[in-house]
Interface confidence: medium
């Protein structure tokens, strides 16, 4: 009988009477920026070092009574969730606490910045093993706080933050909106998003994943043997910080990009009821609940990919949206999506020496999203091959012509506002899997990659009758790198990857006749790396 | 943490100094920007993070902070440097009147300035 939250993050092979997964994150140091803590609590005694760092604003109200147990409440609980003896995730992790929140749980952006700087200086003075920084706090969007998080992440530190408890788009808050930070939303025992009074967990494209965050039992600062149940995205973030500590302890050389990809890969998929989120946020919000990997080693052979959504382009005619991968990731494909269906496609382009995915709005469109498929592909050499609009009626096509390069994704982009609603679909000739085919008035972009042992194949699923959604998934052992719709289906709203499934969305079927125009084909490019598989076998 | 506006023992009312010139005026065409929290109740006007360009050294940060104090003093404003950042971002934290923002944005090396704001336990 273990608390529901520890059971939820534990893969079945660990589940015994007690939650005791192998190695408790002992090689990792977790920094906690929060309230003061009760370091002599039975749960965390000897596990948490209270640093002398303190930068907090005065408490509000002249009659505020500073009571130690109240001041320590939030931080003590979170320290317990990360590394508590009985109710912690990473029981072996050591922690250091910095006080940046006052007795009312309030701090400042400047105080948090100075705290992050303190961590960086400590890291330089005394380099230790992997560092995880837990930021169980949120304020309004802050350019400077996000920038500081980016710098610290680029110094090799893993930052985990609360998505926020405002039942709102996490991109409006910091540090939740910082792309380099792992941003965590909260779910409950029923895998539903957490409601907190009239508000609840934040959501949207800036959330990386969800974790248990309701009725989480942990150390209470009322006494050294007391426990309390608390709820919030802080608690969810603490779970992920604990999982990260476990993963880094098992594989100390993991980069932030590798860690994030593993967190996503080992999460429970599609268990959250998306109806809780506002309709326009459902497609953007990851349906992932964090879990520990089933074994601490041996994940290296897999080709890991994740989907990154851009911010909304806005409705102006020439508006564009850009989705970017993390520095250590490869952009293997690029797609776009518009709720109105009015878009001018997408293209992969170089920006600052790195490929980005840019989507284009169309006249009368409400705006577009760019969707990047970002993958971990060591020693990869990727390039984009472009074919301009063709004159021929067969449509535009482009393939990977370099020796050893394989097709990982197809994009198409057109200058005209409307690709001609009444033109029949152009079907890709069979037996030519290594090429992208598009509408004759579109330019087509093929993402071609060379990497040791990389092999890819194309998988299609076509539905003759109109459907709001067509999907095609990659089989076990293969990873989805590219997702697009076959050209000619002008009512397609766009295509995007959800885990290992390619989703092509169309306009409401009631507005579309059941002619050949209704036909929708989803095209998935599925890849695997034999090189990574061999490397991991050699390690074992 | 500093007291309310009463605690000004470190506030500088500097005389005009050689620092207070325009020798290092910002490069032509690059304008520093000002940012503040979109959620009004969370704003903390009167405290600002002045972020300097990426490659700015600590000595330049300190010089820029002193220059701001000197120029502000010439206009009759008290300012207080609360912290000089280095290690993550170059810059400094300053307690000053919002009236001085225009002046501060014109200082050399300044990338952007952000008004301080509140963060909350989640």
């Amino acid at each position: 009988s273990i608390p529901w939250n520890l059971e939820r993050i534990t893969p079945p092979r660990y589940r015994a009477d007690e939650y005791q997964p192998p190695d408790g994150g002992s090689l990792v140091e977790v920094y906690l920026l929060d309230t003061s803590i009760q370091s002599d609590h039975r749960e965390i005694e000897g596990r948490v070092m209270v640093t002398d760092f303190e930068n907090v604003p005065e408490e509000d109200g002249t009659r505020f009574h500073r009571q130690a147990s109240k001041c320590d409440s939030h931080g003590t609980h979170l320290a317990g969730v990360v590394s508590g003896r009985d109710a912690g995730v990473a029981k072996g992790a050591s922690m250091r606490s910095l006080r940046v929140l006052n007795c009312q749980g309030k701090g400042t952006v400047s105080g948090t910045l100075i705290g992050l700087e303190f961590i960086r200086k400590s890291q330089l003075v005394q380099p230790v093993g992997p560092l995880v920084v837990l930021l169980p706090l949120a304020g309004g969007y802050s350019r400077v706080l996000n920038a500081a998080c980016q710098r610290l992440a680029r110094a090799g530190v893993v930052l985990v933050t609360a998505a926020g408890n405002f039942r709102d788009d996490a991109c409006l808050y910091s540090p939740a909106s910082a792309p380099e930070v792992i941003t965590v939303g909260a779910t409950n025992a029923q895998d539903q998003p957490v409601t907190l009074g009239t508000l609840g967990t934040n959501f949207g494209r800036c959330v990386d994943l969800f974790a248990p965050g309701e009725d989480i039992i942990g150390a209470s600062s009322d006494c050294s043997t007391c426990f309390v149940s608390q709820s919030g995205t802080s608690q969810a973030a603490a779970h992920v910080a604990g999982i990260a500590a476990m993963m880094l302890s098992a594989e100390p050389e993991l980069t932030l990009a590798e860690l994030r990809q593993r967190l996503i890969h080992f999460s429970a998929k599609d268990v959250i009821n998306e109806a809780w989120f506002p309709e326009d946020q459902r497609v953007l919000t990851p349906n992932l609940v964090a879990a520990l990997p089933p074994s601490t080693h041996g994940a290296g052979w897999q080709l890991f990919c994740r989907t990154v959504w851009s911010a909304h382009s806005g409705p102006t005619r020439m508006a564009t949206a850009v989705a970017r991968c993390a520095p250590d990731e490869e952009l293997l494909s690029c797609s776009s999506f518009s709720r109105s269906g009015k878009r001018r496609g997408e293209r992969m382009e170089a920006q600052g020496g790195k490929l980005v995915c840019r989507a284009h709005n169309a006249f009368g469109g409400e705006g577009v999203y760019a969707i990047a498929r970002c993958c971990l592909l060591p020693q990869a050499n990727c390039s984009v091959h472009t074919a301009p609009p063709a004159e021929a009626s067969m449509g535009t096509r482009v393939h990977c012509h370099q020796q050893g390069h394989v097709l990982t994704g197809c994009s198409s982009h057109w200058e005209v506002e409307d690709l001609g609603t009444h033109k029949p679909p152009v079907l890709r000739p069979r037996g030519q899997p290594n090429q992208c085919v598009g509408h004759r008035e579109a330019s087509i972009h093929a993402s071609c990659c060379h990497a040791p042992g990389l092999e890819c194949k194309v998988k299609e699923h076509g539905i003759p009758a109109p459907q709001e959604q067509v999907t095609v998934a990659c089989e076990e052992g293969w990873t989805l790198t590219g997702c697009s719709a076959l050209p000619g289906t002008s009512h397609v709203l766009g295509a995007y990857a959800v885990d290992n499934t390619c989703v092509v969305r169309s306009r409401d079927v009631s507005t579309t006749g059941s002619t050949s125009e209704g036909a929708v084909t989803a095209v998935a490019i599925c890849c695997r790396s034999r090189h990574l598989a061999q490397a991991s076998q050699e390690l074992q | 943490q500093e007291d309310e506006d009463g605690d000004y023992e470190e506030l500088v009312l500097a005389l005009r100094s050689e620092e207070d010139g325009l020798a290092e005026a910002p490069e032509h065409g690059t304008t520093a920007t000002f940012h503040r929290c979109a959620k009004d109740p969370w704003r903390l006007p009167g405290t600002y993070v002045v972020v300097l360009k990426e490659e700015t050294h600590l000595s330049q940060s300190e010089r820029t902070a002193r220059r701001l104090q000197a120029q502000a003093a010439r206009r009759g404003y008290l300012t207080k440097i609360l912290h000089v950042f280095h290690g993550l971002l170059p810059g400094f934290l300053v307690k000053m009147s919002g009236d001085l923002l225009e002046l501060a944005l014109k200082l050399p090396h300044v990338d952007y300035i952000e008004e301080d704001s509140s963060v909350f336990a989640q």
Epitope: S69, T225, C226, F227, S229, Q230 | -
Partner: antibody, heavy 131, light 106 residues
Framework: QVQLVQSGAEVKKPGSSVKVSCKAS????????ISWVRQAPGQGLEWMGG????????NYAQKFQGRVTITADESTSTAYMELSSLRSEDTAVYYC????????????????????????WGQGTLVTVSS | DIQMTQSPSSLSASVGDRVTITCRAS??????LNWYQQKPGKAPKLLIY???TLQSGVPSRFSGSGSGTDFTLTISSLQPEDFAVYYC????????FGQGTKVEIK
Amino acid sequence: QVQLVQSGAEVKKPGSSVKVSCKASGGTFNSHAISWVRQAPGQGLEWMGGINPILGIANYAQKFQGRVTITADESTSTAYMELSSLRSEDTAVYYCARHYEIQIGRYGMNVYYLMYRFASWGQGTLVTVSS
Amino acid sequence: DIQMTQSPSSLSASVGDRVTITCRASQGIRSALNWYQQKPGKAPKLLIYDGSTLQSGVPSRFSGSGSGTDFTLTISSLQPEDFAVYYCQQFDGDPTFGQGTKVEIK
């Protein structure tokens, strides 16, 4: 209000073991919130151990470590305390006591506390150890 | 372990008297202290928790105070049914009880 009803008196030989039960009735039984406290004749109260109110992991007083085992059976709403290697000084009344739960609200997000505050007690079980 | 020392170990008082029992912890325990009343042949009964909060159903003549290491139980006007043994119990560490204070009729 939960009533705790304990098993009857026992007479045991030194070196043997005793297992005392504590059944909850009326209200919801929380097997994770039971401690055992003993009282030797004419003496004070002594906490022996309890089921950790959070994880269901037993927590024992240093003095009894290795000799006492506390378990709980959710299906029958019964908690058990087994004391081994009995000696004459173990002659005492053994009480089961339920930890108290209170509703609170701080940061608008806390739900309840569980702690070693013994709000309801069993009637006691006299265990006599004699050769 | 945290030691709890009660004083006095016994006291004689009359109905209507104000009675004070003190309890000292061997180290600071915040407000993590409870007071119990026990009558002969019966199980203890919770009177005060968290140092000063009256358990529901307990007469208001009972009150508790103190925090850190020194705590007090006060009976403002002793009633016939109050003659019993009183125990303090800390729960900041593993629970430990004081040795008890016996309140007898003078």
